[in-house]
Amino acid sequence: RKIPKVGHTFFQKPESCPPVPGGSMKLDIGIINENQRVSMSRNIESRSTSPWNYTVTWDPNRYPSEVVQAQCRNLGCINAQGKEDISMNSVPIQQETLVVRRKHQGCSVSFQLEKVLVTVGCTCVTPVIHHVQ
Amino acid sequence: GITIPRNPGCPNSEDKNFPRTVMVNLNIHNRNTNTNPKRSSDYYNRSTSPWNLHRNEDPERYPSVIWEAKCRHLGCINADGNVDYHMNSVPIQQEILVLRREPPHCPNSFRLEKILVSVGCTCVTPIVHHVA
């Protein structure tokens, strides 16, 4: 929040904001930073002690249509010998993202913002042990 | 959502592309099943590659707050609770879509923006470069 956007040294007057019908917002879906690439460490999904696979979900009425989801390969974690250690747990790490949903109602179409939970990868954790009384 | 009338006759041929600008309902639909037992808040401490969370604030963005992960160690925590530098803690990064106010400071006009966030950390075997 502390960093102002470069080139905007003045504040918009409300009258210079585009008119928007009540209860809605104007959304330009031309993505800023569309071509930036993830500079994640190389193939960490295979090198992790809690490795994961990726699957692509496709929905033509969602923007973006493609959403990539990760699934942990194992319940346990991979030890130094390359074997699964079930005394540890592979668990999914999740993050919310926004998508635009296109809805058809008869011959009309409407658009709705949606929060989607994406599984990003997995991490290896010490299990929580519940002691039975 | 905000309803936009289709062409007269309502043809079957479906426009596959989204229009560049859309009017969307201010209410955000939540697809997330919050009963998911895997959504645990303590992985950041229990992980062999633990991380700290930092609150990133930006009023020109929606959501205005995003929590970012930073790995605590270069190495990973071993069975004895010590940092093992033969393994590496690395951030798991994800591109997410957020809304950016456009023009700036306008309450109900946005543009989609792709940002890269670190969500957590994972423990990996290092890439060893052998010098010839």
Epitope: P4 | I28, R39, S41, R55, E57, P59, P63, S64
Partner: antibody, heavy 119, light 107 residues
Amino acid sequence: EVQLVQSGAEVKKPGASVKVSCKASGYTFTDYEFHWVRQAPGQGLEWMGVIHPGNGGTAYNQNFRDRVTITADKSTSTAYMELSSLRSEDTAVYYCARFLTYEGYFDYWGQGTLVTVSS
Amino acid sequence: EIVMTQSPATLSVSPGERATLSCKASQSVSIDVGWFQQKPGQSPRLLIYHASNRYTGVPARFSGSGSGTDFTLTISSLQPEDFAVYFCQQDYSSPYTFGQGTKLEIK
């Protein structure tokens, strides 16, 4: 209906600690941040810190950093604020407030907990 | 930290009249300002968020304006239940800060 119900009034001696609770109901506890704000008698409001119960992240006002700890228990949908090394100037009403992290504003507040520090 | 300064400290207005409360930020806070009403023995109640958006259930007589450093809360026609203390607050950057309050009293 969203409700934030705080624990009852406390009287503490200087140097002691106090732990105030805030139980949430009527929404998914892990979806929103919890902030703690205090108000000394006849004074304005002072932000103390925040926790996100969904990921465990915390952030504190530097003025309290060494003395305040904010935690959350997902099993009971309760947030806690513990303030240590109490002094007389910590006498105040302590509020928890829900913060909408997407929209960026406080919407619901607890009823407040009066903490009196007196020898 | 950002300092929020409210004026006046006390405002005496007759019921039915208009009340204008001011809030100044020590640096630009965009539109990230909220206004709260507080009555004795009660917790703050949100009236306005993002400088000019009326919160759900808040009467139309309450309106907010401003951006950058100068913000105003206007109550168009004061009702008996409106006499209270009003706080402005910025959540542009943490630590989030509040004004010291304006006490709105019956003239």
